[in-house]
Amino acid sequence: MMTGTIETTGNISAKKGGSVILQCHLSSTMAQVTQVNWEQHDHSLLAIRNAELGWHIYPAFKDRVAPGPGLGLTLQSLTMNDTGEYFCTYHTYPDGTYRGRIFLEVLESSVAEHSARFQIP
């Protein structure tokens, strides 16, 4: 029985050229996390964090994606093309799979404020 919930940074915005932290948090469960996958809007894999073997950043994103903090992911040197959905998938036992969604909007405006708050999608 899956009792946990995924909390995410929800809908966030950040400046073009800047950086942003994508964060998911699994709560309300004692399940053990074996692997966390991070995917972007076209469902291509950005990175995985395996509980035993650590972080693996997909080579194409190595210059712009940094692991952490925690099980989160930091996107750097943002472009307008980075706008869209991002997904964290928590593979756990004995519960199974949990999935969270974040929407990132990259703004041209110099007045764009990085806004992030934890919320349950």
């Epitope: 995985i48 972080w55 004995p94």
Partner: antibody, heavy 125, light 106 residues
Framework: QVQLVQSGAEVKKPGASVKVSCKAS????????IGWVRQAPGQGLEWMGW????????NYAQKLQGRVTMTTDTSTSTAYMELRSLRSDDTAVYYC??????????????????WGQGTMVTVSS | DIQMTQSPSSLSASVGDRVTITCRAS??????LNWYQQKPGKAPKLLIY???SLQSGVPSRFSGSGSGTDFTLTISSLQPEDFATYYC????????FGGGTKVEIK
């Protein structure tokens, strides 16, 4: 084709060390983990640990901690397993095996689909 | 560590028989279970991963089922080349194998 070729049989004295190699070919070496499993004569399979060929991180079976070291050489697509302070009960066939899932498949890492032919290590005085 | 108990440890069967091997985990492992076949003097071969997914190139007479703590490998119609030892392996850290089931000719 995808294959793992291991080094030849070894005979060692108690207290010595052994280093077994496992050369990969036919796939992108850095996209898959490599695990090591051993099998004592007439016995079952025993998990030893594994290594990420991408970042070099390792995870070892607790009973072997401190005696085993797994490494990779990405320039030659070769994985190595060194076992130190050998005892008679380390006598076994040692297998390397490729993780069935690429790091980039999104699948949870865990099964092993391609295996080396095995390396017999005999520990005897 | 999670213990994996396979049963039976050995069985005798004839060509054409339906064979079932079970594997029980000491605690729930979701679907983190794989099955291997090993013939004497050879390396293990992956048959089933994630409890029920058939590995590419493996005949469809092999199937896997179960989740949580109880898992089954079924060979629907035993063939001469299927006489071997079968191992389950759980892939929850730290990985462990079952003790094996030897399938012999009756």
């Amino acid at each position: 084709q995808v294959q793992l070729v291991q080094s030849g049989a070894e005979v060692k004295k108690p207290g010595a060390s052994v280093k077994v190699s496992c050369k990969a070919s036919g796939y992108t070496f850095t996209s898959y983990p490599i695990g090591w499993v051993r099998q004592a004569p007439g016995q079952g399979l025993e998990w030893m640990g594994w290594i990420s060929s991408y970042n070099g991180n390792t995870n070892y079976a607790q009973k072997l901690q401190g005696r085993v070291t797994m490494t990779t050489d990405t320039s030659t697509s070769t994985a190595y397993m060194e076992l130190r302070s050998l005892r008679s009960d380390d006598t076994a066939v040692y297998y390397c095996a490729r993780g069935a899932s690429s790091f980039w498949s999104g699948d949870v890492l865990g099964a092993f689909d391609i295996w080396g032919q095995g390396t017999m290590v005999t520990v005897s005085s | 560590d999670i213990q994996m108990t396979q049963s039976p440890s050995s069985l005798s069967a004839s060509v054409g028989d339906r064979v079932t091997i079970t594997c029980r985990a000491s605690q729930s492992i979701s679907s983190y279970l794989n099955w291997y076949q090993q013939k004497p003097g050879k390396a293990p071969k992956l048959l089933i991963y994630a409890a029920s997914s058939l590995q590419s190139g493996v005949p469809s007479r092999f199937s896997g089922s179960g989740s949580g703590t109880d898992f089954t490998l079924t060979i629907s119609s035993l063939q001469p080349e299927d006489f071997a030892t079968y191992y389950c392996q759980q892939s929850v850290p730290p990985r462990t194998f079952g003790g094996g089931t030897k399938v012999e000719i009756k």
